[in-house]
Interface confidence: medium
């Protein structure tokens, strides 16, 4: 379109001088070199649009959006933010052009967002559209999810106070072990907050958003189901709500649940109940206990009784803080090379962790199971046979922990060698750590049996990038030596390797690599 | 120049959901900012949102987030706000009205003629 | 989000008469964003001042806006029997947008 003006749009970046900084046109600013956003014009839209490149900013930065339009005569100009006009002052630059700019200060997430821009030129209207949008998370928040009673309903609403806003899904499962895995069949998945049916097997709410996905189960004891080996124990920090739910099952209606604490009867308000009848016409009944924010004193025994069905209890503990306990003692592994194994970490934490496995400084998915002690296990098994460092962190709002583990795969030597003018070295990497021999090529010795002792130093290093044992011996020239072959070995308990060097200038000349078995 | 034709009358249930079309004759649609705004009976204007089609960038009050929606479609030249979870005190009139950016303004030059939507068991 | 509260809540007046009708915001309106609209019962809101002080289009010269920062009013220099209707004040340079409660100007 002939018409259509030439538009160009940039961004500059400012470096704060820790000046106050104003919107005019002279801020007291260092700026870097204006980027190019190359406002594009947009196909199949009704009227004219321009797009810019999607600008990514770091929190409490300063920016400079500016369009540059070359088109004849006066122009007015508008930027409209969040359904909100801003002011605009277009002024005229030395070629001409016309100058809109948006100071963005100290950039915060309430500034992120799409920033249009409404131009009237004597000849036309047009709209350009800028993304400006913050660099890094630090301002995002994943909580948990916890439960509220509906007013006036026998519902639970399920709340998880995070930024950006998350989705709330309720996660249902009637059937019961790993039949509840999160793909299952049996698990049915509700993209809402409130929740009515309250008399499934398994419960959980989950909340997710851009930094990832966090779960609350809804703590149950089943009076139908034979009482775990030990006792159920629920952590709760100060000022979190507490909800258990007991079920029970019963072929009529004839009988009622009751929640004791520390043998006391809970007071009215911290309980409700429902009933319903299942597909069998049998009788299903659930009782909440529930405290909107417990303190010290709401620890102890929860019992659950009914007329019908052998009472069971609960140990609800209420801590200060959050934990993680687990041993921190450093761990040391050695399996054969193609040897099945997993390291694995055993703890108890509240709140839930989130928990890294790194091997030379790549991280790894970090899964986490419930075991019915009240211990949760973490297990990693790609370790494809690596030796090594693995780190295994974990940590919740109020704790960290760590712990290192050593994997050292069992197999023969593997030599490397390289000669310098004054000395041989040789290096090996099999486990267990090899011993090394030296031994003289000659016309006495055509099979290299003459063993070398003198000028022979051994040492052991930590390749530092794996954190695996690597062996090397040096052999220091003596003119007894120079200008024959010599061979280094190294042996373990699986086998020996060797390599040959010919001594006689600078650099490495492996000649001959041996393998003995 | 432009009309918005909203679409009739509602009576809704407490607790369901309600949709209000709003659609654009003449002039240009997408680039020009639709609120959405509501009249109680005997009571003032209420802003709730709105949506600049083109950009599909939408802005609500803090008041009605979480329960209002609002979409467009360019093709149709029309706009649309979903309200869910009604409850009675959400009995009122809900105006389309696009805004104005001529002389760089962005006030709400045009109003369609009103919804009105009774919240009734 | 910024609070306008309008002033008087009804004004009572004769035709010819002038009204005067006060918009306060609680925060700074930026760049003067302000506007006024009248409504007539059973009718949808029509813009009249935009920018605090400009008038849209086919609106009569005896409206005018004026003020800025925190302080706004509408003048109606001589009121004509159609004026009687109800007036709103909304900002619309701070997301969200609010509207005045509205002043009620009616028949003496």
């Known amino acids: 379109n002939q018409d259509l003006p030439v538009i160009k749009c940039v961004l500059i970046n400012h470096k704060n001088n820790d000046s106050s900084v104003g919107k005019s046109s002279s801020y007291p600013m260092v700026s870097e070199s204006p980027e190019d956003l190359g406002c594009a014009l947009r196909p199949q839209s009704s009227g004219t649009v321009y797009e810019a490149a999607a600008v990514e900013v770091d929190v409490s930065a300063s920016i400079t959006l500016q369009v540059l339009v070359d088109a004849p005569g006066n122009i007015s100009c508008l930027w409209v933010f969040k359904h909100s006009s801003l002011n605009c002052q277009p002024h005229f630059d030395l070629q001409n052009r016309g100058v809109v700019s948006m100071v963005i200060l100290k950039m915060t997430e309430t500034q992120a967002g799409e920033y249009l821009l409404f131009i009237q030129s004597e000849a036309t209207n047009y709209t350009i559209l800028f993304t400006v949008s913050i660099r890094n998370t630090l301002l995002y928040t994943l909580r948990r999810p916890y439960f509220r009673k509906m007013e006036n309903q026998d519902a639970l609403v399920c709340i998880s106070e995070s930024v950006p806003e998350p989705i709330v899904e309720w996660v249902l499962c009637d059937s019961q072990g790993e039949s509840c895995k999160e793909e299952s069949p049996a698990v049915v998945k509700k993209e809402e907050k409130v929740l009515h049916e309250l008399f499934g097997t398994d419960i959980r709410c989950c909340a997710r958003n851009e930094l990832g996905r966090e779960c609350t189960r809804l703590f149950t004891i089943d009076l139908n189901q034979t009482p775990q080996t030990t006792l159920p124990q629920l952590f709760l920090k100060v000022g979190e709500p507490l909800w258990i739910r007991c079920k029970a099952v019963h072929v009529n209606h004839g009988f009622g649940l009751t929640w004791e604490l520390e043998n006391k009867a809970l007071e009215e308000g911290n309980y409700f109940e429902m009933s319903t009848y299942s597909t069998n016409r049998t009788m299903i009944r659930i009782l909440f206990a529930f405290v909107s924010s417990v303190a010290r004193n709401d620890t102890g025994y929860y019992t659950c009784s009914s007329s019908k069905h052998p009472s069971q209890s609960a140990l609800v503990t209420i801590v200060e803080k959050g934990f993680i306990n687990a041993t921190n003692s450093s761990e040391d592994y050695e399996i054969d090379q193609y040897e099945e194994f997993c390291f694995s970490v055993r703890f108890k934490a509240y709140p839930q962790i989130r928990c890294t496995w790194t091997f030379s400084r790549k991280s790894f998915p970090c899964e986490q199971k419930g075991l019915d002690n009240g211990y949760s296990i973490s297990k990693f098994c790609n370790h494809k046979h690596q030796p090594g460092e693995y780190i295994f962190h974990a940590e919740n709002d109020d704790a960290q922990f760590t712990k290192m583990f050593t994997l050292n795969i069992r197999r023969k030597p593997q030599v490397l060698a390289e000669a310098s003018a004054s000395q041989a070295s040789c290096f090996s990497d099999g486990y267990p750590l090899p011993s090394w021999t030296w031994k003289k090529c000659s016309d006495k010795s055509p099979n290299c049996t003459e063993e070398i002792t003198e000028g022979v130093w051994n040492r052991k290093a930590n390749r530092k990038v794996f954190g695996q044992w690597v062996s090397s011996s040096t052999l220091n020239m003596s003119e007894a030596i120079k200008g024959f072959l010599v061979k280094c070995c190294a042996y373990n308990s699986l086998g020996t390797s060797c390599e040959t060097i010919l001594l006689n200038s600078p650099g490495p000349f492996p000649f001959i690599q041996d393998n003995i078995s | 120049q432009v009309q918005l034709v909203q679409s009739g009358a509602e009576v809704k249930k407490p607790g369901s959901s309600v949709k209000v079309s709003c659609k654009a004759s003449?002039?240009?649609?997408?680039?020009?900012?639709i609120s959405w705004v509501r009249q109680a009976p005997g009571q003032g204007l209420e802003w709730m949102g709105g949506i600049i089609p083109i950009f599909g960038t939408v802005t609500y009050a803090q008041k009605f987030q979480g329960r209002v929606t609002i979409t467009a479609d360019e093709s149709t030249r029309t706009a649309y706000m979903e309200l869910s979870s009604l409850r009675s005190e959400d009995t009122a009139v809900y105006y389309c009205?696009?805004?104005?950016?001529?002389?760089?303004?962005?006030?709400?030059?045009?109003w369609g003629q009103g919804t009105l939507v009774t919240v009734s068991s | 989000e910024i609070v306008l509260t309008q002033s008087p809540g009804t004004l009572s007046l004769s035709p010819g008469e002038r009204a005067t009708l006060s918009c306060r915001a609680s925060h700074s309106v930026s760049s003067s964003y302000l506007a006024w609209y009248q409504q007539k019962p059973g009718q949808a809101p029509r813009l009249l001042i935009y920018?605090?002080?400009s008038r849209a289009t086919g609106i009569p010269d005896r409206f005018s806006g004026s003020g800025s920062g925190t302080d706004f009013t509408l003048t109606i220099s001589r009121l004509e029997p159609e004026d009687f209707a109800v007036y709103y004040c909304?900002?619309?340079?701070?997301?969200?947008?609010?509207f005045g409660q509205g002043t009620k100007v009616e028949i003496k």
């Open positions: 909304q900002q619309y340079g701070s997301p969200p947008r609010t």
């Open positions: 920018g605090a002080s």
């Open positions: 009205a696009r805004d104005s950016w001529s002389g760089a303004t962005g006030a709400s030059d045009t």
């Open positions: 003449g002039g240009t649609f997408g680039s020009y900012g």
